[in-house]
């Protein structure tokens, strides 16, 4: 099957890095500077994609890959393949149309990207606050009221870490 | 081919003055909204200021009621106007599209200029 198909189709011959040359007979060139073909048989050769302003190279273009882009410092990757480029904002913050704002009372980011998220509500657990929750960081939830009895220790250990909002499995 | 230029660069003293423009050509300039970005010695990239095609301004808080983003439609020229410079503002600035119109974010279609250099000194 594949000598048939080489047969019927010259350009089937042509390797990854090449592309099948009409003008030339359909023989097998090299892809021009700054273009690639990620696999056999191709007709043409794809421009490598330019990563400037605020992108910065991550891995070059050679005749047989695409270049990778990522974003220069003080911005992070969104989209597929790093299609954007977003401006970081520090922690306790979040991006909105004007700038990085701060968190509103009640939520928080540990990151420097996304948005401010609400603290844990530790009575839907039926345990308390143990330690106060800041922009910045979620409230720590301790043991529930009930478990502070007199003699009883009012300092656990903090459970593992979990998203905010959800309850233990 | 999308070419955008930069001048207006230079050295200015504390508290001076600097007009930026930025001329474009090989798009439709009047229907794209376009940003200023800025670099400095040794720091990474920040969003300064963008417009929309309509003329909605955004600004980043540390350039705001000292800076004012402005647009030429029949010039095809986008400026920056900036006031009461201080010598944390010494870097280069870069013009450049906007084609995600949102805050601090720019696309891999975006197109850049090749930057003016402001320097804030005495």
């Known amino acids: 099957f594949e000598r048939t198909r080489s047969l019927q189709d010259p350009c089937s011959n042509c390797p990854a890095g090449t592309f099948c040359d009409n003008n030339r007979n359909q023989i097998c060139s090299p892809c021009p500077p700054n273009s690639f073909s990620s696999a056999g048989g191709q007709r043409t050769c794809d421009i490598c994609r330019q990563c400037k302003g605020v992108f910065r190279t991550r891995k070059e273009c050679s005749s047989t890959s695409n270049a990778e882009c990522d974003c220069t410092p003080g911005f992070h990757c969104l989209g597929a393949g790093c299609s954007m480029c977003e401006q970081d904002c520090k922690q306790g913050q979040e991006l909105t149309k004007k700038g990085c704002k701060d968190c509103c009372f009640g939520t928080f980011n540990d990151q420097k990207r996304g948005i401010c998220r609400p603290w844990t509500n530790c009575s839907l657990d039926g345990k308390s606050v143990l330690v106060n929750g800041t922009k910045e960081r979620d409230v720590v939830c301790g043991p529930s009221p009930a478990d502070l009895s007199p003699g009883a220790s009012s300092v656990t250990p903090p459970a593992p870490a979990r998203e905010p909002g959800h309850s233990p499995q | 081919e999308v070419q955008l230029l930069e001048s207006g660069g230079g050295l200015v003293q504390p508290g001076g003055s600097l007009r930026l423009s930025c001329a474009a050509s090989?798009?439709?300039?009047?229907?794209?909204?376009m940003s200023w970005a800025r670099q400095a010695p040794g720091k990474g990239l920040e969003w300064v200021s963008g417009i929309y095609s309509g003329g909605s301004t955004y600004y980043t808080e540390s350039v705001k009621d000292r800076f004012t983003i402005s647009r030429d439609n029949s010039k095809n020229t986008v400026y920056l106007q900036m006031n009461s410079l201080k010598p944390e503002d010494t870097a280069v600035y870069y013009c450049?599209?906007?084609?995600?119109?949102?805050?601090?974010?720019?696309?891999?279609?975006?197109?850049w200029g090749q930057g003016t250099l402001v320097t804030v000194s005495s």
């Open positions: 090989g798009f439709t300039f009047s229907s794209s909204a």
């Open positions: 450049a599209t906007w084609g995600t119109l949102r805050f601090g974010v720019w696309a891999e279609y975006d197109h």
